[in-house]
């Protein structure tokens, strides 16, 4: 499987909510001996590989925000901790995987990464990630609502797998 990022850039006004999205592509094993781990984190555009560094999102680590389930099951993050920070990550039956950030501030600007790991009994992890940029703007140049910019087909397939 691969991960696609439908949008590579989100430009939002301060105070707005945004939902960043990744999508699983390709066949997904739903066997009893396979589990999917999905999470979000902030990162930096490394010279060699984007999404290597894992920084917290609003003080929540990638482990705080992870989802853990089989196949295309739906899942949500544990509500208390994430929602106290204005965050919620979710996964649906169709391979869509998102994080919603409420009441954006300028400090939320940066590179965001989704990570999906297939964990299978006796096998090495299969890891894929996607990256997208969030720009939070203020003042007269800021849009009234979030504006999203689609990834080029090349970018949306440009995924790193171990």
């Amino acid at each position: 499987f691969k991960v696609a990022t439908p949008y590579s850039l989100y430009v939002c006004p301060e105070g707005q909510n945004v939902t960043l999205t990744c999508r699983l592509l390709g066949p997904v094993d739903k066997g009893h001996d396979v589990t999917f781990y999905k999470t979000w984190y902030r990162s930096s555009r490394g010279e060699v590989q984007t999404c290597s560094e894992r920084r917290p999102i609003r003080n929540l680590t990638f482990q705080d925000l992870h989802l853990h389930h089989g196949g295309h099951q739906a899942a949500n993050t544990s509500h208390d901790l994430a929602q106290r920070h204005g965050l919620e990550s979710a996964s649906d039956h169709h391979g869509n995987f998102s994080i919603t950030m409420r009441n954006l501030t300028l400090l939320d600007s940066g590179l965001y990464c989704c990570l999906v790991v297939e964990i299978r009994h006796h096998h090495s992890e299969h890891r894929v990630h996607g990256a997208m940029e969030l720009q939070v703007q203020t003042g007269k140049d800021a849009p009234s609502n979030c504006v999203v910019y689609p990834s080029s087909s090349q970018d949306s397939e440009n995924i790193t797998a171990a």
Epitope: V117, H122, H123
Partner: antibody, heavy 119, light 107 residues
Framework: QLQLQESGPGLVKPSETLSLTCTVS??????????WGWIRQPPGKGLEWIGS???????YYNPSLKSRVTISVDTSKNQSSLKLNSVTTADTAVYYC???????????WGQGTLVTVSS | DIQMTQSPSSLSASVGDRVTITCRAS??????LAWYQQKPEKAPKSLIY???SLQSGVPSRFSGSGSGTDFTLTISSLQPEDFATYYC?????????FGQGTKLEIK
């Protein structure tokens, strides 16, 4: 803060089974998204990964030890255990338990326990 | 199995020196490489993950670089507490493997 503490006999006879326990405090061993691993280090030598157990119960072993090793967890005691059977003197080492998140390296380690295999 | 080869095996240096340790993987491991520091009678401590990302709480004089098969750990200005043994580890695939270690000694 997470703490890992290995315990078990410091001396095991050749051909017997080495049994060690790793007690976790400051966190739950059943937390999803983590592996609980064992690494060993013979005196004066380097590190060797023995195996890891994922929170779902999946196990991963070093092929060089796979026929002799079993890693399990007891969630009620918040413990991981290592069993290595048919030991020889080559199994003399400091044994560490360690935790690693999904798609990450070992970020938390116990202080290690020396096990000597000798008759 | 992926073999990890470190060089040099031992190294003498002085406080304030810049030191570089290299690690080579027998096959490509992307950026799935970690560096650890181990002092005598102590457990290893994680310094670097994902080849170049600093573990929380680790001083910024430590840095890592590389991708694929060739990696380096650099200490920009050696401090007295940095004299120890350093190990690289690949976590690209099972079985996870470590380099044989580099012992950093005081000159």
């Amino acid at each position: 803060q997470l703490q890992l503490q290995e315990s078990g006999p410091g001396l095991v006879k050749p051909s017997e089974t080495l049994s060690l326990t790793c007690t976790v405090s400051g966190g739950s061993i059943s937390s999803s998204g983590y592996y609980w691993g064992w690494i060993r280090q013979p005196p004066g030598k380097g590190l060797e990964w023995i195996g890891s157990l994922y929170s779902s119960g999946y196990t991963y072993y070093n092929p060089s030890l796979k026929s002799r090793v079993t890693i399990s967890v007891d969630t009620s005691k918040n413990q991981s255990s290592l069993k290595l059977n048919s030991v020889t003197t080559a199994d003399t080492a400091v044994y560490y338990c360690a935790r690693h998140p999904v798609a990450m390296n070992f970020d938390d380690w116990g202080q290690g326990t020396l096990v000597t295999v000798s008759s | 199995d992926i073999q990890m080869t470190q060089s040099p095996s031992s190294l003498s240096a002085s406080v304030g020196d810049r030191v570089t340790i290299t690690c080579r993987a027998s096959q490509g491991i992307s950026s799935w490489l970690a560096w650890y520091q181990q002092k005598p009678e102590k457990a290893p401590k994680s310094l670097i993950y994902a080849a170049s990302s600093l573990q929380s709480g680790v001083p910024s004089r430590f840095s890592g670089s590389g991708s694929g098969t060739d990696f380096t750990l650099t200490i920009s200005s050696l401090q007295p507490e940095d004299f120890a043994t350093y190990y690289c580890q690949q976590y690209n695939s099972y079985p996870y493997t470590f380099g044989q270690g580099t012992k950093l000694e005081i000159k």
